[in-house]
Interface confidence: medium
């Protein structure tokens, strides 16, 4: 297993609809045909997997249909979008990239993107 640098933004603010997007960029040392991207969430020293997808160079990034993540890939960049976020989902979201094939296997883990989610205020009742 060889190390690889992964860069991602330090902070992202989710939209009022609970959607957060960020770019995960990796420094590919070789010409990989298969790349696996995993998003991990770290909160209160607990790490959980949010979503994962594998893609082939020249093809699009596809998450499973029931995933809260969507994304696109372009070269060594992956544009990730996480949906359905609520205030309780605020935390550090870490991008993990694996170059699966061909050998050697490379692994890179970003420093994480702190995603802040603010639940929208409920609309006040209006009397007409």
């Amino acid at each position: 297993c060889k190390a690889m640098h992964v860069a991602q933004p330090a902070v992202v603010l989710a939209s009022s609809r609970g959607i957060a997007s960020f770019v995960c960029e990796y420094a590919s040392p070789g010409k990989a045909t298969e790349v696996r991207v995993t998003v991990l969430r770290q909160a209160d020293s607990q790490v959980t997997e949010v979503c994962a997808a594998t893609y082939m160079m020249g093809n699009e990034l596809t998450f499973l249909d029931d995933s809260i993540c969507t994304g696109t890939s372009s070269g060594n960049q992956v544009n990730l979008t996480i949906q359905g976020l609520r205030a309780m989902d605020t935390g550090l979201y870490i991008c993990k990239v694996e170059l699966m094939y061909p050998p050697p296997y490379y692994l890179g883990i970003g420093n994480g993107t702190q995603i802040y989610v603010i639940d929208p205020e409920p609309c006040p009742d209006s009397d007409f």
């Epitope: 298969e34 994962a52 997808a53 082939m56 699009e60 699966m100």
Partner: nanobody, 115 residues
Framework: QVQLQESGGGLVQAGGSLRLSCAAS????????MAWYRQAPGKQRELVAG???????NYVDSVKGRFTISRDNAKNMVYLLMNSLKPEDTAVYYC?????????WGQGTQVTVSS
């Protein structure tokens, strides 16, 4: 875990055609990509063609216009139709399944193209 079984390989004359099939079983719900790789004697295994769960395909330049990959999700199958075969297409062809937590290979099927 996912298991893959290829079939359809054989001996064919240059200019001929073959259709390879790959049957997937096991945790197939977690597969987003299916692909065919090939490995010629003394060479590294190379990606030939891939198809994702939405049906988007990609091909290595050397087979574009000659090979067609397709996927039947209902039958958990992936196919590789190979037309206008050349001697340099001779190799063991491997089926590949990829997903968030899946990376499986088939056992391979031999394709030999004689001139």
């Amino acid at each position: 875990q996912v298991q893959l079984q290829e079939s359809g390989g054989g001996l064919v004359q240059a200019g001929g055609s073959l259709r390879l099939s790959c049957a997937a079983s096991g945790s197939i719900f977690s597969i987003n990509h299916m692909a065919w790789y090939r490995q010629a004697p003394g060479k590294q295994r190379e990606l030939v063609a891939g198809v994702n769960s939405r049906g988007t395909t990609n091909y290595v330049d050397s087979v574009k216009g000659r090979f067609t990959i397709s996927r039947d999700n209902a039958k958990n199958m992936v196919y590789l139709l190979m037309n206008s075969l050349k001697p340099e297409d001779t190799a063991v062809y491997y089926c590949r399944a990829l997903g968030g937590a899946v990376a499986a290979w088939g056992q391979g099927t031999q394709v030999t193209v004689s001139s």
